[in-house]
């Protein structure tokens, strides 16, 4: 209309999707009577009457707003509930008297998008790709208006860069009117990006101001060629025979190339391929000294068939050879002397020790053990231990048995055995001597004999307890070329008075009556020998 003042900018009302918008009619009393107002929505420059106010009473017009409008604030404010993105438009109120004036309100609608959903390229990216490859996608669903996406690498925003970084985004409108933003980051990556952290950020606005949401951080599988190959040996440090040793081939490429491990043959001067497991690891278990040598790894790129060779690695499996003792089976008369010599080879300096087998007592530090004025008790085992002090656990031993010539020597001279009449008794008798003695019994029964060692024998006798046996007792006799000796077992009947708590009898009484074959063990379990004069 000519001469009409330019329309003022509409009042801005900002509201979130789903909430209620309060549209306050800003007409002054001079511009119109608020008890007589028409409300319109304006969409694509088309006005639609949506609400009438007459004498302060409101009435919705049929249509999309019919159920969502109500009057507030004594008729000055129109409340629009359950706001949707489609409600983002101009609303105007028009007073009817004294002259038609209107007041315009611009409704702005906002909704925060959902958390951005980032998906990384599951197949990975080669560093030598001809153009930027798809690194990751980012989806921000159900935002309004369209959020802005920013991609980050290691916390720094990524900018479009020709032939290096390209960000492609698109949006779709859902039936709700909300936007779903989709973005894909394309980039040319380098080897150093294998540990890079990527994420996307959605920037959006709400009535309360600007906001942002970040996706989780992702790393991208980056493929790059192998430049260096090397060998690693586990365990680190000095190796010894018997260890489990793993020789592993490693490369700085991704994916790892195909590996083969070979060992130099000193005699042919050629490398021989070793059999590795599925992971390309050569396992030596148990490691032997023959495994010592020079190892190297060859890595093959199966695409280019280019191979790389590692630096050779010397492997030393430390060992101690079998220990040899001379003489190997010494025999000596009482009173004589003996020199025992121990020998062994090793990849390292050796230490020798001589120990008494029965007691583990160290007799000598060194390879030679000298024994003088040999007594009968000197018979038995002597152990030479050859060890490498610098490698714990690397040692070998050899046992030698010294035999002292002499008549049989009984483990006990006499013993009391508690018995019950008519029980089957299991008696045992032990003797030693050189030459090895044999044992006989003075009563009938089932006897069995077993070697304890070359100079010692154990005989067991199963016999029925009879009154006669109780009377006579039992004798065992050990004999060899140099003499004989006897042990006596006295049999005593059990009665209740015998079994007093303070009884210090240590002979083997069986109180079992369930079986007639109860064992009454008369074997001395202690090698504490009586005085020599008590021997027969």
């Amino acid at each position: 209309v000519p001469g009409e003042a330019e329309q003022p900018a509409p009042e801005l009302v900002e509201v979130e999707v789903g909430s209620t918008a309060l549209l306050k009619c800003g007409l002054s009393q001079s511009q119109g009577n608020l008890s007589h107002v028409d409300w319109f929505s304006v969409h694509k420059e088309k006005r639609t009457l949506i609400f009438r106010v007459r004498q302060g009473q409101g009435q919705s017009e049929p249509g999309e707003y019919e159920q969502r409008l109500s009057l507030q604030d004594r008729g000055a404010t129109l409340a629009l509930t359950q706001v949707t993105p489609q409600d983002e438009r101009i609303f105007l109120c028009q007073g009817k008297r004294p002259r038609s004036q209107e007041y315009r309100i611009q409704l702005r609608v906002y909704k925060a998008p959902e958390e951005p959903n980032i998906q990384v390229n599951p197949l990975g990216i080669p560093v030598n790709s001809k153009e930027p490859e798809e690194v990751a996608t980012c989806v921000g669903r159900n935002g309004y208006p369209i959020p802005q996406v920013i991609w980050y690498k290691n916390g720094r925003p990524l900018k479009e860069e020709k032939n290096r970084v390209h960000i492609q985004s698109s949006q779709t409108v859902e039936s709700s009117g909300l936007y779903t933003l989709q973005s894909i980051l394309k980039a040319q990556l380098v080897k150093e990006d294998k540990d890079a952290q990527f994420y996307c950020e959605l920037n959006y606005r709400l009535p309360s101001g600007n906001h942002m949401k970040e996706s989780r951080e992702v790393t991208v599988p980056v493929f790059y060629p192998t430049e260096k190959v090397w060998l690693e040996v586990e365990p680190v440090g000095m190796l010894k025979e018997g260890d489990r040793v793993e020789i592993r081939c490693l490369a700085d490429g991704n994916p790892p190339p195909h590996f083969s491990i070979s060992k130099g043959n000193p005699s042919t001067r050629e490398a021989e391929e070793e059999t590795t497991n599925d992971n390309g690891v050569l396992v030596l278990e148990p490691a032997r000294k023959e495994h010592s040598g020079r190892y190297e790894c060859q890595a093959w790129n199966l695409d280019t068939m280019i191979s790389l060779l590692s630096e050779p690695q010397e492997l030393l499996v430390n060992y101690v050879s079998d220990v040899r003792v001379s003489p190997a089976a010494p025999e000596r008369q009482e009173g004589s002397s003996l020199t025992l010599t121990c020998e062994a080879e090793s990849s390292q300096d050796l230490e020798f020790q001589w120990l008494r087998e029965e007691t583990d007592q160290v007799l000598e530090r060194g390879p030679v053990l000298q024994l003088h004025d040999l007594k009968r008790e000197a018979g038995g085992g002597y152990r030479c231990v050859a060890s490498v002090p610098s490698i714990p656990g690397l040692n070998r031993t050899q046992l030698v048995k010294l035999a002292i010539f002499g008549p049989p020597w009984m483990a006990f001279k006499e013993r009391k055995v508690w018995v019950k009449e008519n029980m089957v008794l299991n008696l045992s008798c032990e003797a030693s001597g050189h030459p090895r003695p044999t044992i006989s019994w003075n009563v009938n029964g089932t006897a069995s004999e077993g070697d304890q060692d070359p100079q010692r024998v154990l005989s067991t006798l199963n016999v029925l307890v009879t009154p006669e046996l109780l009377e006579t007792g039992v004798e065992c006799t050990a004999s060899n070329d140099l003499g004989k000796n006897t042990s006596i077992l006295f049999l005593e009947l059990v009665n209740l008075t015998t079994l007093t708590p303070d009884s210090n009898t240590t002979t083997g009484l069986s109180t079992s009556t369930a079986s007639p074959h109860t064992r009454a063990n008369s074997t001395s379990t202690e090698r504490k020998l009586p005085e020599p004069e008590s021997r027969g």
């Epitope: 998906q119 990384v120 599951p122 197949l123 790709s129 001809k130 490859e133 798809e134 996608t137 989806v139």
Partner: antibody, heavy 118, light 106 residues
Framework: QVTLKESGPVLVKPTETLTLTCTVS????????VSWVRQPPGKALEWIAA???????YYNSAFKSRLTISRDTSKSQVVLTMTNMDPVDTATYYC????????????WGQGTLVTVSS | DIQMTQSPSSLSASVGDRVTITCKAS??????LAWYQQKPGKAPKVLIF???SLQTGIPSRFSGSGSGTDFTLTISSLQPEDFATYYC????????FGQGTKLEIK
């Protein structure tokens, strides 16, 4: 609209090489990646190989040494070759388009059944 | 490689039933999972992507949920055309599919 169509021999002999072609329409091979997926009779789906929109090739490591995937963007074709075929390779072979803003397959060809038999 | 295990391997149900199919990943795949429907002699068709997003044109009776290692496809009210085999697929590291769940009419 988006379509993908597989073509190639229905029967190959053991040890021979299989060549399959996927002809696409309704989209450009420079905007979407294409994968090959196979399905032996009565069995599950198995991804074989892919070529990205940028032309990078990817293979299932179980078949890697036997596979080659390539494309001809001017003909809108993706070609898969698989050497040293075996009766266990008998399957329906599908080509599938990778969704442009995701990593799943939004359009598939109808598939072609390849039988390996002497 | 990531393994995907579906259960059950087969399932009988009636029209109108609510049906749930589960898929378990051998390691955390976040929400990098899609569900496909395949009918005999036909190619698979994507239903759900990113674990819970409904593909355009797919009826809203289909829904997906889960994250990490455990995922579910739910059909709220079975229709006659829903009887088919359903596959899950991970796209977190490479591509692997579940062994399938055959949904049959009871």
């Amino acid at each position: 609209q988006v379509t993908l169509k597989e073509s190639g021999p229905v029967l190959v002999k053991p040890t021979e090489t299989l060549t399959l072609t996927c002809t696409v329409s309704g989209f450009s091979l420079t905007s979407n990646g294409v994968s090959w997926v196979r399905q032996p009779p009565g069995k599950a789906l198995e991804w074989i190989a892919a070529i990205s929109s940028g032309g990078t090739t990817y293979y299932n490591s179980a078949f890697k040494s036997r596979l080659t995937i390539s494309r001809d963007t001017s003909k809108s074709q993706v070609v898969l070759t698989m050497t040293n075929m075996d009766p266990v390779d008998t399957a329906t072979y599908y080509c599938a388009r990778r969704y442009g803003y995701g990593w799943y397959f939004d359009f598939w060809g109808q598939g072609t059944l390849v039988t390996v038999s002497s | 490689d990531i393994q995907m295990t579906q259960s059950p391997s087969s399932l009988s149900a009636s029209v109108g039933d609510r049906v749930t199919i589960t898929c378990k990943a051998s390691q955390n795949i976040y929400n990098s999972l899609a569900w496909y429907q395949q009918k005999p002699g036909k190619a698979p068709k994507v239903l759900i992507f990113n674990a819970n997003s409904l593909q355009t044109g797919i009826p809203s009776r289909f829904s997906g949920s889960g994250s990490g290692t455990d995922f579910t496809l739910t059909i709220s009210s079975l229709q006659p055309e829903d009887f088919a085999t359903y596959y899950c697929q991970q796209f977190y590291s490479g591509y692997t599919f579940g062994q399938g769940t055959k949904l049959e009419i009871k």
